[in-house]
Amino acid sequence: AESCTSRPHITVVEGEPFYLKHCSCSLAHEIETTTKSWYKSSGSQEHVELNPRSSSRIALHDCVLEFWPVELNDTGSYFFQMKNYTQKWKLNVIRRNKHSCFTERQVTSKIVEVKKFFQITCENSYYQTLVNSTSLYKNCKKLLLENNKNPTIKKNAEFEDQGYYSCVHFLHHNGKLFNITKTFNITIVEDRSNIVPVLLGPKLNHVAVELGKNVRLNCSALLNEEDVIYWMFGEENGSDPNIHEEKEMRIMTPEGKWHASKVLRIENIGESNLNVLYNCTVASTGGTDTKSFILVRKADMADIPGHVFTR
C-alpha cells in the first residue's frame, strides 16, 4: 500500500497527475459511515468543499484526492476532515520548464562515490497499474534499456555517469495521455576519506550488578556509513534467553560521519552472567576496535580498583 502524504508542504509541477493521501486511512475504512470531506482554501476563497463536480480534473477515492492533472490554479491549502481528525497540506504548483525534459526545482540530488554501487530504478507504486511504459533519460537523451516498464541502471559509478537522470512514466486515464517525471541530479565524487572507526569510552568496563536485576550495556562508536557495530559474548554455551540486543541507533555528525550506539540488555541477571566477557566490536574493511564489559556482583566491588568501574 502506498504511504500517506505526511509532508505538510508540497511542491509539484503543473500538468502532471498528482494525489494527496490522508494519514488516517486505515481508520477511515473502519468508520465507513463517517462523513469525510476534502476542502481547499486559497487567497480569496475560504474552505471550499471539493467534489468531482468542482472540477473534471479532481477524483476522490476512499483516502485519496487525485488531480488529473494538477494545474497552477490548484495552488493553495488543502484539508481532509473526518469527525475530529483534520490533516492539512500546503500545495505549491510550479510552472513546467517547456525547454527541458525536467523542471530544475523538482530535482533530487544524489552524491555517489566513484567505483561505489550506483543505482537508478524508475518506479511509481501509486500509478503502477496505469503506467503503459516508462523511459529513462540522461541529460534529456533517452537511454536504450531492456525493461520499458521499470528501466533500471545498476553499476559501479564512473565519472562519466554524472548528470541528470529523468524517469518519465507514461499513463492513460479517461482516454487522455499523461506523464510523470522524476529527476535525479547525480554527482560523482572521489572516494571520500574514511575515518578509522573507534569505540567511545574505556576498553574494559566492570559493571556492578545485583542478581535478579537488569542491566543495559551501552556501546557507542564513531564510524563510517558502511561500518558495523555488534555484540559478541559466550553464546557457545547455548543462547541465553535473558540477553537481548536492541536495534542500533545512528545519527549523522556534522562532518558526515556516523555516531552509532547499540545496547545489550541483560534481564534477571544470574550467576552465569557474572565474570564473563561481553564484547562490543566496531568493524570496517580497514580493521576493528573492541571493548569489553564484565558484570561483577556489587558485593565484590571492593576487590576492583575504582578507576576501572562504570555504573
Partner: nanobody, 115 residues
C-alpha cells in the same frame, strides 16, 4: 571480482519464506565467524545471525525461531533460510565476516515483505 555476492531476495507476502545465499570468492569462510546483516531503509546494518567456524549459531530476538543460518564450506557459501517473514523483515541483506576486518561489502539482496 566482488568478494561477497548475496542473492535470493525478492518480494513476498507475510508468512512466506526465502532462502538467501552469499557466495564468497577469495578468502575461505570456514575459518571465519560469518554473519548476516539486515539494513532497513535509512538505518545502519544490524547483525541478525552469525555462525562460528565450528558451526555454533546465534540469532537476535527478532529472527529467533524463524531464520536459520548455515554454511557450505566446500562451496564457500553462507545461507540464510527465512521463514514466517513479516513486514519488519523488509530491507537489504548483506553477509560479512566477524571478529576481524570486514570483507568488502557485496551489493546486498533486497527482501520486501508486503501484503
Amino acid at each position: 571480482d566482488v568478494p561477497l555476492q548475496e542473492s535470493g531476495g525478492g518480494l513476498v507476502q507475510p508468512g512466506q519464506s526465502l532462502r538467501l545465499s552469499c557466495a564468497a570468492s577469495g578468502s575461505p569462510i570456514r575459518f571465519s565467524v560469518m554473519g548476516w546483516f539486515q539494513q532497513a531503509p535509512g538505518k545502519g546494518r544490524d547483525l541478525i545471525a552469525r555462525i562460528t567456524s565450528g558451526g555454533i549459531v546465534y540469532y537476535t530476538d527478532s529472527v529467533k525461531g524463524r531464520f536459520t543460518i548455515s554454511k557450505d564450506n566446500a562451496k564457500n557459501t553462507l545461507y540464510l533460510q527465512m521463514n514466517s517473514l513479516n513486514l519488519e523483515d523488509t530491507g537489504v541483506y548483506y553477509c560479512n565476516r566477524l571478529g576481524g576486518a570486514l570483507f568488502d561489502w557485496g551489493q546486498g539482496t533486497q527482501v520486501t515483505v508486503s501484503s
